[in-house]
C-alpha cells in the first residue's frame, strides 16, 4: 500500500518545505484516497465485468450509498460552507460500514483497502476540526450497521462482486464531489 | 497525462457566440475533471468554468455565469464551452486543462494537463 500523505520520501528529504494548511492536508489526504479507490477498482474490474455496466443501470440498486443532492450546499446553485461540510462529515461516517464491507474482497489489494479505511478516518478528523456546527453531524447507530455488514456479507457471490464495485464507484463520486465543494471554502 | 486540444475560437462580434470544445485521443477521459482558463493579453490566467467527473457538477466563475454553459460528450471524449453574449472583455487566449482525479476546481494548481489555447476575440 502506499505510504500516507506526508510521510513520503519527497517529504522527508524537504524538511525546509512550509507545513501544509488545514485545506492543503485536507486535499492531499482526499487525493491519496482517490488513488486507493483507483487500485481497488483495477482489481475488481480485472476480476468481474461489472465496470462495463452503465451508470443508469448500476443506479438501479436497494444500497443506501451516501450521494450529493442540491440541497446539500455542495454545489454551486446554492453553497453553503456549514451545510456542505457537515453533509461530508455525515457521509463519510455513513461510508465506514460500506468501508469496512470491502475489507475482506480483495485478494492482492488487502492493504489497499486498509489503507483507504484507515485514511478515510483520518479524513473525518481533519473534517471535523474544521466543522464549527458539529451538534448538527449525525453519527450512525453501531447496531444498525453491524446489522447490515452481516446482511451484505451473506449475499451470493455475484451481488458481492457488484456490491463492491457500487461502493467503490460511489465513494469516488463522493469524495470528487466533496473535494470540488472543499476547493471552494 | 492526457494531450488536450482546443478549438472554435474566432473574431465574434459583441452580443454574438461561439463554442470552444476541448478534444483528447486519450482513454479514460470521462474520469477527468476539465476546465476552461483564459489570458487576456497583459494578464494573469483565470478560470472561467470546469465540469467534474460527473457532468452534473459544474462551476462557473461570476463574470461568466448565466453567459457561458460548460457541458461534456464522452462518447466523442471532449468538452464544450458555450459562450453566448460575449463582450469585448470576454477577448483572451482560452485554454482547457483536465485532472486525473475527476475533481477540478478553479485553480490551475488542481489541473495536470493543459492545451495550447485558442484565440477568442470580441471586436465590433
Known amino acids: 500500500a502506499p505510504v500516507p500523505p506526508g510521510e513520503d520520501s519527497k517529504d522527508v528529504a524537504a524538511p525546509h518545505r512550509q507545513p501544509l494548511t488545514s485545506s492543503e492536508r485536507i486535499d492531499k489526504q482526499i487525493r491519496y484516497i482517490l488513488d486507493g479507490i483507483s487500485a481497488l477498482r483495477k482489481e475488481t474490474c480485472n476480476k468481474s465485468n461489472m465496470c462495463e455496466s452503465s451508470k443508469e443501470a448500476l443506479a438501479e440498486n436497494n444500497l443506501n450509498l451516501p450521494k450529493m443532492a442540491e440541497k446539500d450546499g455542495c454545489f454551486q446553485s446554492g453553497f453553503n460552507e456549514e451545510t456542505c461540510l457537515v453533509k461530508i462529515i455525515t457521509g463519510l461516517l455513513e461510508f465506514e460500514v460500506y468501508l469496512e464491507y470491502l475489507q475482506n474482497r480483495f485478494e492482492s489489494s488487502e492493504e489497499q483497502a486498509r489503507a483507504v479505511q484507515m485514511s478515510t478516518k483520518v479524513l473525518i478528523q481533519f473534517l471535523q476540526k474544521k466543522a464549527k456546527n458539529l451538534d448538527a453531524i449525525t453519527t450512525p447507530d453501531p447496531t444498525t450497521n453491524a446489522s447490515l455488514l452481516t446482511k451484505l456479507q451473506a449475499q451470493n457471490q455475484w451481488l458481492q462482486d457488484m456490491t463492491t464495485h457500487l461502493i467503490l464507484r460511489s465513494f469516488k463520486e463522493f469524495l470528487q464531489s466533496s473535494l470540488r465543494a472543499l476547493r471552494q471554502m | 497525462e492526457v494531450q488536450l486540444v482546443e478549438s472554435g475560437g474566432g473574431l465574434v462580434q459583441p452580443g454574438g457566440s461561439l463554442q470552444l470544445s476541448c478534444t483528447t485521443s486519450g482513454r479514460h477521459f470521462d474520469e477527468y475533471a476539465v476546465g476552461w482558463f483564459r489570458q487576456a493579453p497583459g494578464k494573469e490566467r483565470e478560470f472561467v468554468a470546469d465540469?467534474?467527473?460527473?457532468?452534473?457538477?459544474?462551476w462557473y466563475a461570476h463574470s461568466v455565469k448565466g453567459r457561458f454553459t460548460i457541458s461534456r460528450d464522452d462518447a466523442k471524449n471532449t468538452v464544450y464551452l458555450e459562450m453566448d453574449g460575449l463582450k469585448p472583455e470576454d477577448t483572451a487566449v482560452y485554454y482547457c486543462?483536465?485532472?486525473?482525479?475527476?475533481?477540478?476546481?478553479?485553480?490551475?494548481?488542481?489541473?495536470?494537463?493543459w492545451g495550447q489555447g485558442t484565440q477568442v476575440t470580441v471586436s465590433s
Open positions: 465540469i467534474g467527473e460527473n457532468a452534473d457538477n459544474t
Open positions: 486543462a483536465a485532472d486525473k482525479y475527476g475533481v477540478g476546481g478553479n485553480a490551475q494548481g488542481y489541473y495536470d494537463s
